[in-house]
């Protein structure tokens, strides 16, 4: 808290300019009018104030706007944004994408802070859904943003927004998140032809069900092993050897190197050894010839 002292003669600020960096904290408090500051916020960012001085300027704005800053001020906060707490930000009503971009720019190149997370949360909640332009902006600044959302939050993403998602945006997503995103992607890309569709849907396939993988196996897609290894184990298990061979195309040879890792390991255990041998890869661990496989889950469903 800065003590209230009279402004020395001749030091009253008529505008926000670089001369203010030479003011002591108490002089800033006494000589800068909060209303002047609010109308000239765009200048603050161009002036190399110390963090201590920024604290004083923030204090002046807090007194002027105890219920939260108007968007006209928020948009021009610049470095002063680095002085805001999540509690401050929760008082804001940010509706303009330009304001969001301006504030994200301040933290560009640095990891997401609680302040940025709060800002994004306020913005998205205010919009009601994560539209394409917002998603475009957020993933440009934070490629991992999408995967930081809960499945519940992801459910508010409209399929049209999926066009903004790049493969790297999904790198850290877990299966629960991909389960939500995959149907949206399928819907978004449904009018594309086979090869183009596969290029777009590939990053989302960690959420694909068995029937969709079976359908893809009929389309000569040549899925790479990295994508195959990210598929849901429960979706891969029912695939036949022939279907996996068609799905992977020339990449099928990569199964040998992955035979001890899921989902390949679990899939091998479900296949007849005879069928695995047809691949000529030396995959071992399949069901020996002459053994009968009972699908107990099917039996339970019938009883």
């Amino acid at each position: 808290e800065v003590e209230k002292t009279a402004c020395p003669s001749g030091k009253k600020a008529r505008e926000i300019d670089e001369s203010l960096i030479f003011y002591k904290k108490w002089e800033l408090e006494a000589c800068v009018d909060a209303a002047l500051l609010a109308t000239q916020m765009d200048r603050v960012n161009a002036i190399p104030f110390t963090y201590e001085q920024l604290d004083v300027l923030k204090h002046k704005l807090d007194e002027l706007y105890p219920q939260g800053y108007p968007e006209s001020v928020i948009q021009h906060l610049g470095y002063l944004f680095l002085k805001m707490s999540p509690e401050d930000i929760r008082k804001w009503n940010v509706t303009s994408l330009e304001t969001l971009k301006a504030l994200l720019e301040v933290n560009k190149g640095h990891e997401m802070s609680p302040q940025v997370a709060t800002l994004i949360d306020r913005f998205v909640k205010g919009r009601g859904q994560l539209d394409k332009d917002t998603l475009d902006t957020l993933t440009a600044f934070y490629p991992g943003y999408l995967c930081s959302l809960s499945p519940e939050e992801l459910s508010s993403v409209p399929p049209s927004s999926i066009w903004a998602v790049r493969p790297q945006d999904l790198d850290t997503c877990d299966p629960r998140q991909l389960d939500v995103l995959y149907p949206k992607a399928r819907l978004a890309f449904q009018n594309m032809n086979g090869s183009e569709y596969f290029v777009k849907i590939q990053s989302f396939l960690g959420g694909a069900p068995t029937e969709d993988l079976k359908a893809l196996s009929q389309q000569n897609v040549s899925m790479d092993l990295a994508t195959f290894m990210k598929l849901r184990t429960d979706a891969v298990l029912p695939l036949t050897v022939a279907e996996v061979q068609k799905l992977l195309g020339p990449h099928v040879e990569g199964l040998k190197a992955e035979e001890r890792h899921r989902p390949v390991r679990d899939w091998i255990l479900r296949q007849r050894q005879d069928d695995l041998d047809t691949l000529g890869l030396g995959l071992q661990g399949g069901i020996p010839n002459g053994y009968l496989v009972l699908d107990l889950s099917m039996q339970e469903a019938l009883s």
Epitope: P48, T50, E52, H110, S113, Q115
Partner: nanobody
Framework: QVQLVESGGGLVQAGGSLRLSCAAS????????MRWYRQAPGKGLELVAT????????YLGSVKGRFTISRTNAKNTLLYLQMNSLKPEDSALYIC????????????WGQGTQVTVSS
């Protein structure tokens, strides 16, 4: 963390020149603005000059035209203060300061280098 070490101070006659240096090490990529402050015996800390992250320089009125602040953003960030036409009233401990990006933004200080101007 950023470490700052000043050098270049000393005793000089009025009208003479000195060049102060401040070497920064540690998380130098996160440095935003850099500054020279000074503190004369029994007086408060006074900002002498600032160089912003975009290279713009700002000077205290009484040193404008005599002092020049500059910085290099190479692997070893260095801050300089070229002081010409020195006056006895410039005598003080000159301290280097840098601040960094982030929440909360942090301020870092050197130990200072003494400048004494004799008349």
């Amino acid at each position: 963390q950023v470490q700052l070490v000043e050098s270049g101070g000393g005793l000089v006659q009025a009208g003479g020149s000195l060049r102060l240096s401040c070497a920064a090490s540690g998380s130098i990529s996160s440095i935003r603005h850099m500054r020279w402050y000074r503190q004369a015996p029994g007086k408060g800390l006074e900002l002498v000059a600032t160089v912003s992250n975009d290279g713009s320089a700002y000077y205290l009125g009484s040193v404008k035209g005599r002092f020049t602040i500059s910085r290099t953003n190479a692997k070893n960030t260095l801050l300089y203060l070229q002081m010409n036409s020195l006056k006895p009233e410039d005598s003080a401990l000159y301290i280097c300061n840098a601040d960094t990006w982030g929440w909360p933004g942090a301020d870092y200080w050197g130990q200072g280098t003494q400048v004494t101007v004799s008349s």
